[in-house]
């Protein structure tokens, strides 16, 4: 798996370089996770030709995956930095159970799946430091998450393929929207 941002040999070898700002570190972290998702999607696509499925399919599923909406204040129209940051952190916390589900879904990219999961935890920590209103962030209930995970793992193989595909695609879209919004902050 690729080395997480801030741990590559270039950072060690170039002490004279300006340290990354908080915003730069977050930006780099998100791009690193997006690269990991691309690698995982490649394996998923190769396994069962799932990547040609239509866009409408994303809406037509019973997974409660986090999604950006106008009210979240992350889009250019009606942009609200504080509301948006709360949405990004809350959304990432909600994605954690789905990232846990992905851990046993990859054969050749097992390390990559783990890297995406761990890097997301680090990203949440970065963003929590940036947030002023931590009280507004709701943490998912562990019991609810545990039963959701059990339910997802009990699905048949076709549904597990679909679920994997939907999680990766939704997570990618959520991170891309977050990246655009964070660059405005």
């Amino acid at each position: 798996a690729p080395v997480p941002p801030g741990e590559d040999s270039k950072d060690v070898a170039a002490p004279h370089r300006q340290p990354l700002t908080s915003s730069e570190r977050i930006d780099k972290q998100i791009r690193y996770i997006l690269d990991g998702i691309s690698a995982l999607r490649k394996e998923t696509c190769n396994k069962s030709n799932m990547c040609e499925s239509s866009k409408e399919a994303l809406a037509e599923n019973n997974l409660n995956l986090p999604k950006m909406a106008e009210k979240d204040g992350c889009f250019q129209s009606g942009f609200n930095e504080e509301t948006c940051l709360v949405k990004i952190i809350t959304g990432l916390l909600e994605f954690e159970v789905y990232l846990e589900y992905l851990q046993n879904r990859f054969e050749s990219s097992e390390e990559q799946a783990r890297a995406v999961q761990m890097s997301t935890k680090v990203l949440i920590q970065f963003l929590q430091k940036k947030a002023k209103n931590l009280d507004a962030i709701t943490t998912p209930d562990p019991t609810t998450n545990a039963s959701l995970l059990t339910k997802l793992q009990a699905q048949n193989q076709w549904l597990q393929d679909m679920t994997t595909h939907l999680i990766l695609r939704s997570f990618k879209e959520f991170l891309q929207s977050s990246l655009r919004a964070l660059r405005q902050m």
Partner: antibody
């Protein structure tokens, strides 16, 4: 009323190709996973291939993998089975079927006979 | 691949009898087990899905049970129209294999 109508069967020589079609009506085709099941004369049912809703995944029995291709055209409400390198043992009645939300095959076509013989 | 083994392969019974057909999977398939009835020259008909759910329009004399690897189809009181071949099918794995069938004949 749900209807599945297969076509495209017939007599073909070993090594030849055929494309079966299954025209669907009476339900929202794109939302449904679909499959092909065959039955050789006097034998039991054999699951051949399946495609999940929207074409997320395509799946094949080992006996046909690499030779058969399942596909769907949601705009035409049609399921296809492209069969290449046909063998005598592929001779059977081919049924197209819809998957129920509980993962049983709840609606079946009337079947189309494929005969592979020289 | 998951193998599905039905027993018996054939059985003779009389109208009014209670009949049980079993199906065993070579590995756990949770409750992804379906039962079908097929009459000569006709397409199969779904009777039971998800191991124990009765398909709409199917008489209540048909019932299914089991989970994991062992499943049963029971016909509580055989009717003349029930003489047919019955198949189990798993839809848990990637390949949705059928059992070899059980032919139910009139005694």
């Amino acid at each position: 009323e749900v209807q599945l109508l297969e076509s495209g069967g017939g007599l073909v020589q070993p090594g030849g190709s055929l494309r079966l079609s299954c025209a669907a009506s009476g339900f929202t085709f794109g939302y449904s996973s679909m499959g092909w099941v065959r039955q050789a004369p006097g034998k039991g049912l054999e699951w051949v291939s399946g495609i999940s809703s929207y074409g997320y995944g395509t799946y094949y029995a080992d006996s046909v993998k690499g030779r058969f291709t399942i596909s769907r055209d949601n705009s035409k409400n049609t399921l296809y089975l492209q069969m290449n390198s046909l063998r005598a043992e592929d001779t059977a009645v081919y049924y197209c079927a819809r998957y129920h939300s509980g993962w049983g095959m709840d609606y079946w076509g009337q079947g189309t006979l494929v005969t592979v013989s020289s | 691949d998951i193998q599905m083994t039905q027993s018996p392969s054939s059985l003779s019974a009389s109208v009014g009898d209670r009949v049980t057909i079993t199906c065993r999977a070579s590995q756990s398939i949770s409750s992804y087990l379906n039962w079908y009835q097929q009459k000569p020259g006709k397409a199969p008909k779904l009777l039971i899905y998800a191991a124990s759910s009765l398909q709409s329009g199917v008489p209540s004399r048909f019932s299914g049970s089991g989970s994991g690897t062992d499943f049963t189809l029971t016909i509580s009181s055989l009717q003349p129209e029930d003489f047919a071949t019955y198949y189990c099918q798993q839809s848990f794995a990637y390949l949705h294999t059928f059992g070899q069938g059980t032919k139910l004949e009139i005694k």
